[in-house]
């Protein structure tokens, strides 16, 4: 009976662990290639997939181009942005580019916006080169509260690589706030 009870307790613990793990919020969002803004100015990227290809979301919300936190906690945030240009797709307006990504947190309760991470570089992309490519990856560990929103801004959106393995961002909860 004791052994039986231990087995039941063990499986209940497993189940509890598993359901807790399943409840751990995460999101991996990939760029929506059909709705990338044009131009060279800094813009907020609002069109992302959350439920196709590599994109998935659980216990977080994607709304109005922003990833919304549903549970307080410490989260690992990441973003990967690829820029590319091939001469067959047109000309570059300028050969001197600042290729940047900004990961921003917005709080609704106290309306404010903070850049959590930024990355990028100034680049010389000669008009005489057939193909150009540049990738930025940023990641960090942040305390996030329920209702806070994460968004992505980039420069030169017309140069974004639209593939799901190239331009994406995400988050996953690592632990609770004590």
């Amino acid at each position: 009976i004791r052994a039986e009870k231990a087995m039941v307790d063990g499986s209940w613990l497993d189940l509890a662990k598993r359901s807790k793990l399943e409840a751990q919020p995460f999101a991996h969002l990939t760029i929506n290639a059909t709705d990338i803004p044009s131009g060279s100015h800094k813009v907020s990227l609002s069109s992302w997939y959350h439920d196709r290809g590599w994109a998935k979301i659980s216990n977080m919300t994607f709304s109005n181009g922003k990833l919304i936190v549903n549970q307080d906690g410490f989260y690992y945030l990441y973003a990967n942005i690829c820029f590319r240009h091939h001469e067959t797709s047109g000309d570059l307006a300028t050969e001197y580019l600042q290729l940047m990504v900004y990961v921003t947190k917005t709080s609704i309760k106290i309306p404010s916006s903070h850049t959590l991470m930024k990355g990028g570089s100034t680049k010389y992309w000669s008009g005489n080169s057939e193909f150009h490519f540049y990738s930025i990856n940023v990641g960090g560990f942040f305390k996030l509260r329920s209702g806070e929103e994460i968004s992505i801004e980039v420069s030169n959106p017309s140069l974004l690589d639209p593939d799901q393995d190239a331009t994406y961002f995400g988050a996953f909860k690592v632990r609770d706030i004590d």
């Epitope: 001469e87 067959t88 000309d91 307006a93 005489n128 057939e130």
Partner: antibody, heavy 118, light 111 residues
Framework: QVQLVQSGAELKKPGASVKLSCKAS????????LQWVRQAPGQGLEWMGA????????KYTQKFKDRFTITADKSKSTAYMQLNSLKSEDSAVYYC???????????WGQGTLVTVSA | NIVLTQSPASLAVSLGQRATISCRAS??????????MHWYQQRPGQPPTLLIY???NLESGVPVRFSGSGSRTDFTLTIDPVEADDAATYYC?????????FGGGTKLEIK
């Protein structure tokens, strides 16, 4: 298919200005440099300058810089070139043109004849 | 500015023979492993048409009788065999460096 349609012939007096237009179709107007090339009667081709219609960036040959302006109206997919203080030696056929998908000028307007005469 | 010098200024070639036109640049027009030299044909009263791009690539729809070669400062357009329809003026052009420049032209006459 890519098409560049230019405005009609112009007869101008020395010292006057001329403004020519070039309407583009068949491609995204804002993603290629649009060039202007001229050819005086019986002479060779002379590259004058270009515009990138998106942000309106321009580049000019030094020779024309002071009296030559290229502009674009994105809403009309049309580029314009204005040449001021005309001289008789500005009499020429003026072409607008665009590069091909690789390189080289693959697309040309039909040309606009500008005659400068007293 | 890069100066392009074409030679000869004019040439007469018999039907079915080979025509060779040379273009020499005052400095190299090569960069990123490519030669930014192009060749055009122009008939009277018409805009030019692109024949060869990047020194040796045949533009779509251009007969294989036309070919281009060369690198850095010395380039050649070859027409072999020449046909009656090839009577025109031929221009080289570089777009390696602003301002883009054209050669002075070569007038081809068919004998």
């Amino acid at each position: 298919q890519v098409q560049l349609v230019q405005s009609g012939a112009e007869l101008k007096k020395p010292g006057a200005s001329v403004k020519l237009s070039c309407k583009a179709s068949g491609y995204t107007f804002t993603t290629y440099w649009l060039q202007w090339v001229r050819q005086a009667p019986g002479q060779g081709l002379e590259w004058m300058g270009a515009i990138y219609p998106g942000p309106g960036n321009t580049k000019y040959t030094q020779k024309f810089k002071d009296r030559f302006t290229i502009t674009a109206d994105k809403s009309k997919s049309t580029a314009y070139m204005q040449l001021n203080s005309l001289k008789s030696e500005d009499s020429a056929v003026y072409y607008c043109a665009r590069r091909g998908s690789r390189r080289g000028i693959a697309y040309w307007g039909q040309g606009t004849l500008v005659t400068v005469s007293a | 500015n890069i100066v392009l010098t074409q030679s000869p200024a004019s040439l007469a070639v018999s039907l079915g023979q080979r025509a060779t036109i040379s273009c020499r640049a005052s400095e190299s027009v090569d960069s990123y492993g490519r030669s930014f030299m192009h060749w055009y044909q122009q008939r009277p009263g018409q805009p030019p048409t692109l024949l060869i791009y990047l020194a040796s690539n045949l533009e779509s729809g251009v007969p294989v009788r036309f070919s281009g070669s060369g690198s850095r400062t010395d380039f050649t357009l070859t027409i072999d065999p020449v046909e009656a329809d090839d009577a025109a003026t031929y221009y080289c052009q570089q777009d390696n460096e602003d301002p883009y420049t054209f050669g002075g032209g070569t007038k081809l006459e068919i004998k």
